[in-house]
């Protein structure tokens, strides 16, 4: 057959679906690879063909669209499972072609099992809620297109194994789950189960997401440098090791890039000739506030090094701060025989 533009296996789209639930999977060609949509392609006389390779097999085979109750069907650029079975796991390919044009892409589909508490190997999306910030909502994700707007599904929300009914601060409101005032104790996995009828059958869609309660923007402050500070003086003799920690607290800020860096005499350590190493560690509070520590280390400090200016800098979306470390050369202790004796007027 003629050449086909093969986009390979699109592992960025690792699609996971639950066993025994409907799944609608759009051909990724129109979403990520081609500059036109399915309608345009269809009007131009292009045909969309689906096939698959079963798990642990190499053989590409056509998808059987003649299963009882149309279990697998295609509608425009969507492949439908009503419902999935465990052995539907494999690599699926959609190919767009006519006599002169061909383009195809494959993607992995994994059908996963869950238990009655919705534990499964499914990768869960994380939804961040601000702590004590007023009413915030999460919405049951990825249920669009499964049923027409005329169908009114029933939605049940769970936390872990248990149905959310009369929570103190969490209220199910159809497709939304409202948190009246989010607290650390609200951290966890929340599941919505959407039940809808179709052609005399009842289908369930299960969607689990992780809620993480984070610091509120109301409480956010610019970076705070805890160290270096005015109370600690780094007094060293030449030849000793100089270690200066720069410890900075960052309030949680959505999508903020937190940065910490040292300058020595106004230059980045990489831009000067002294033998300096910097080690960084990061820790997070329960609300994802961040503490970054960068330890500046000079193994064998010289008297010149002890005269330099060492400044710790920090930046977040809330602002930029800097603090100089107090570094000085230790005055050698007087040697008794000479200095003290002279001091006492000995001759």
């Amino acid at each position: 057959s003629e050449r086909c533009d093969d986009w390979g296996l699109d592992t960025m789209r690792q699609i996971q679906v639950f066993e025994d639930e409907p799944a609608r999977i759009k051909c990724p060609l129109f979403e990520h690879f081609l500059k036109f949509n399915y309608s345009t392609a269809h009007s131009a006389g292009l045909t969309l063909i689906w096939y698959w390779t079963r798990q642990d097999r190499d053989l590409e085979e056509p998808i059987n669209f003649r299963l009882p109750e149309n279990r697998i069907s295609k509608e425009k650029d969507v492949l439908w499972f009503r419902p999935t079975l465990l052995n539907d796991t494999g690599n699926y390919t959609c190919m767009l072609r006519n006599t002169t044009y061909c383009s195809k892409v494959a993607f992995p589909l994994e059908v996963v099992q869950k238990d009655s508490c919705f534990n499964s190997p499914m990768k869960l999306p994380v939804h961040k809620l601000y702590i004590e910030y007023g009413i915030q909502r999460i919405t049951c994700p990825n249920v669009d297109g499964y049923f027409p707007s005329s169908v009114k599904p029933t939605i049940t929300w769970y936390m872990g194994c248990y149905k959310i009914q009369n929570f103190n601060n969490v209220i199910p409101e159809g497709m939304n789950l409202s948190f009246l005032i989010a607290l650390i104790s609200n951290n966890g996995n929340y599941t919505c189960v959407v039940t809808y009828p179709e052609n005399g059958r009842t289908f369930h869609l299960t969607r689990t997401l992780t809620v993480k309660v984070v610091g509120s923007p109301k409480n956010a402050v610019p970076p705070v440098i805890h160290s270096p500070n005015d109370h600690v003086v780094y007094e060293k003799e030449p030849g000793e090791e100089l270690l200066i920690p720069c410890t900075v607290y960052f309030s949680f800020l959505m999508d903020s890039r937190n940065e910490v860096w040292w300058t020595i005499d106004g230059k980045k350590p990489d831009d000067i000739t002294i033998d300096v190493t910097i080690n960084e560690s990061i820790s997070h509070s329960r609300t994802e506030d961040e503490t970054r520590t960068q330890i500046l280390s000079i193994k064998k400090v010289t008297s010149e090094d002890l005269k330099r200016s060492y400044v710790c800098h920090a930046r977040s979306a809330k602002g930029e701060v800097a603090k100089a470390a107090k570094v000085k050369q230790k005055v050698p202790a007087p040697r008794y025989t000479v200095e003290l004796a002279c001091g006492f007027g000995a001759t």
């Epitope: 009655s116 936390m159 872990g160």
Partner: antibody, heavy 120, light 107 residues
């Protein structure tokens, strides 16, 4: 060491209600779930329902729906199971059992059991 | 609901011998199965969850296997304290259900 201490034995008349308590000590109450499981004399185990005390989120076995109410008081780390419209076949030992987390459907700590006898 | 069937109802074994207990589910429960031990007058004790993972503090002589509908609890060398009733529990579907139990008695 986590301990679940249940209230004492009860003798009840048919048609009445019983409320059994289960107090957790030596471990945090929050973040866990508590289930109630019963065992009729010489019989196997039967799960009735459970609760996440922190939130009051509950689930009940269909068989007991409408007849059982599971509640919890976080301030005293105590869970309660109330069974109404008692009949003779409700005579059993009632256990509270802690899940190892809110997401774990198995039970890692159990109370000592409360015998409820329903007799006219 | 899923019906859990345990066999045999009673198993007579000598101390030091191996005991193999079976649990069958009326439909697939994947690996969502736990095993418990119960001694007379006591509450059950968790032995195994996830069909094969030993709970904290459970001796290595207890092992679980199986998935789908067929499961086995094996006690490799019975000790005197192992004579008890053993229950399996599925938690794949609501309601969670238990088997009727297998009594392991001294031969």
């Amino acid at each position: 060491q986590v301990q679940l201490v249940q209230s004492g034995a009860e003798v009840k008349k048919p048609g009445s209600s019983v409320k059994v308590s289960c107090k957790a000590s030596g471990g945090v109450f929050s973040g866990y779930a508590i289930s109630w499981v019963r065992q009729a004399p010489g019989q196997g185990l039967e799960w009735m329902g459970g609760i996440i005390p922190e939130f009051g989120a509950t689930n009940y076995a269909q068989k007991f729906q409408g007849r059982v109410t599971i509640t919890a008081d976080e301030s005293t780390s105590t869970a309660y199971m109330e069974l109404s419209s008692l009949r003779s076949e409700d005579t059993a030992v009632y256990y509270c059992a802690r899940h190892s987390s809110a997401y774990s459907p198995w039970f890692d700590y159990w109370g000592q059991g409360t015998l409820v006898t329903v007799s006219s | 609901e899923i019906v859990m069937t345990q066999s045999p109802a009673t198993l007579s074994v000598s101390p030091g011998e191996r005991a193999t207990l079976s649990c069958r589910a009326s439909q697939s429960v994947s690996s969502n199965l736990a095993w418990y031990q119960q001694k007379p007058g006591q509450a059950p004790r968790l032995l195994i969850y996830g069909a094969s993972t030993r709970a904290t503090g459970i001796p290595a002589r207890f092992s679980g296997s199986g998935s789908g509908t067929e499961f086995t609890l094996t006690i490799s060398s019975l000790q005197s304290e192992d004579f008890a009733v053993y229950y399996c529990q599925q938690y794949n579907n609501w309601p969670w259900t238990f088997g009727q139990g297998t009594k392991v008695e001294i031969k």
